[in-house]
């Protein structure tokens, strides 16, 4: 919605459900439609409260 898109490597159509491939230390952020630096997902002992364990199958469009 009005975003300028200047970089091809890390873009996808907003309607696409398949994220662009990112570098190993990055992940795809649907909000900004770019690959960004990504931290390791929190493990249970560091405080996640969801019943979905890290590594559980996840639809690509569920990025948040």
């Amino acid at each position: 919605m009005g975003a300028r898109r200047l970089r091809v490597r890390s873009q996808r159509s907003r309607d696409s459900s398949v994220p662009t491939q990112c570098n190993q230390t990055e992940c795809f952020d649907p909000l900004v439609r770019n690959c960004v630096s990504c931290e390791l997902f929190h493990t249970p002992d560091t405080g996640h409260t969801s019943s979905l364990e890290p590594g559980t199958a996840l639809q690509p469009q569920e990025g948040s």
């Epitope: 919605m1 975003a3 300028r4 898109r5 200047l6 970089r7 490597r9 890390s10 907003r14 994220p19 990112c22 992940c27 795809f28 952020d29 649907p30 909000l31 900004v32 439609r33 770019n34 690959c35 960004v36 630096s37 990504c38 931290e39 390791l40 997902f41 929190h42 996640h48 409260t49 969801s50 019943s51 979905l52 890290p54 590594g55 199958a57 996840l58 639809q59 690509p60 469009q61 569920e62 990025g63 948040s64």
Partner: antibody
Framework: EVQLVESGGGLVQPGGSLRLSCAAS????????IHWVRQAPGKGLEWVAW????????DYADSVKGRFTISADTSKNTAYLQMNSLRAEDTAVYYC??????????????????WGQGTLVTVSS | DIQMTQSPSSLSASVGDRVTITCRAS??????VAWYQQKPGKAPKLLIY???FLYSGVPSRFSGSGSGTDFTLTISSLQPEDFATYYC?????????FGQGTKVEIK
């Protein structure tokens, strides 16, 4: 230690301009999207703009589109918000914030984890 | 743009109470919702990301749930330091949008 420090706020007349700065330390802004969020006196949070310095992509709230420009200088590890044609309704505390991402099977799960202290912009004659 | 509607806009509660705040998105945002706490004159603080994941250092009395369009922030036992305003935010599609806020006041 991650820190964001805003500066550049102040009193400006309607139609005037200001440039806000957001100096980051403890991380490189080329890795994360940087957002500006504002809060008018006694009101809620309103997202203003984001920039991804590494990719140069930007987006704006409709209320500021065409008047505000977000940018970043990775060599100075600083993001900016150039505000032109200011209106009384732009009066607010302006915060910059970093969006953190955690890797969920290659997709970002995250939120705005570090915020600056805020800088007050007052538009009045 | 996606609208985020929070309810209630304010509530009065006592220390030890269980408090629930809801947020409804105008369209499906999957689990792309974060919750923030803000105290007067201070910047917001991230509590929950991805609808249900507790951010580092946030007390475990805070929890989040939901997906799609309906989301909930729960404080299991309200503490004195929890009296503040709480905001939800969706980050599924730009522009990211905030709810209007819920002010939690002392009864």
């Amino acid at each position: 230690e991650v820190q964001l420090v805003e500066s550049g706020g102040g009193l400006v007349q309607p139609g005037g301009s200001l440039r806000l700065s957001c100096a980051a330390s403890g991380f490189t802004i080329s890795s994360n999207s940087i957002h500006w969020v504002r809060q008018a006196p006694g009101k809620g949070l309103e997202w203003v703009a984001w920039v991804t310095p590494s990719g140069g992509s930007t987006d704006y709230a409709d209320s500021v589109k065409g008047r505000f420009t977000i940018s970043a200088d990775t060599s100075k590890n600083t993001a900016y918000l150039q505000m032109n044609s200011l209106r009384a309704e732009d009066t607010a505390v302006y915060y910059c914030a970093r969006r953190v991402c955690y890797n969920r099977l290659g997709v970002c799960a995250g939120g705005m984890d570090y915020w600056g202290q805020g800088t007050l912009v007052t538009v009045s004659s | 743009d996606i609208q985020m509607t929070q309810s209630p806009s304010s509530l009065s509660a006592s220390v030890g109470d269980r408090v629930t705040i809801t947020c409804r998105a105008s369209q499906d945002v999957s689990t792309a919702v974060a919750w923030y706490q803000q105290k007067p004159g201070k910047a917001p603080k991230l509590l929950i990301y991805s609808a249900s994941f507790l951010y580092s250092g946030v007390p475990s009395r805070f929890s989040g749930s939901g997906s799609g369009t309906d989301f909930t922030l729960t404080i299991s036992s309200l503490q004195p330091e929890d009296f503040a305003t709480y905001y939800c935010q969706q980050s599924r599609i730009s522009p990211p949008t905030f709810g209007q806020g819920t002010k939690v006041e002392i009864k």
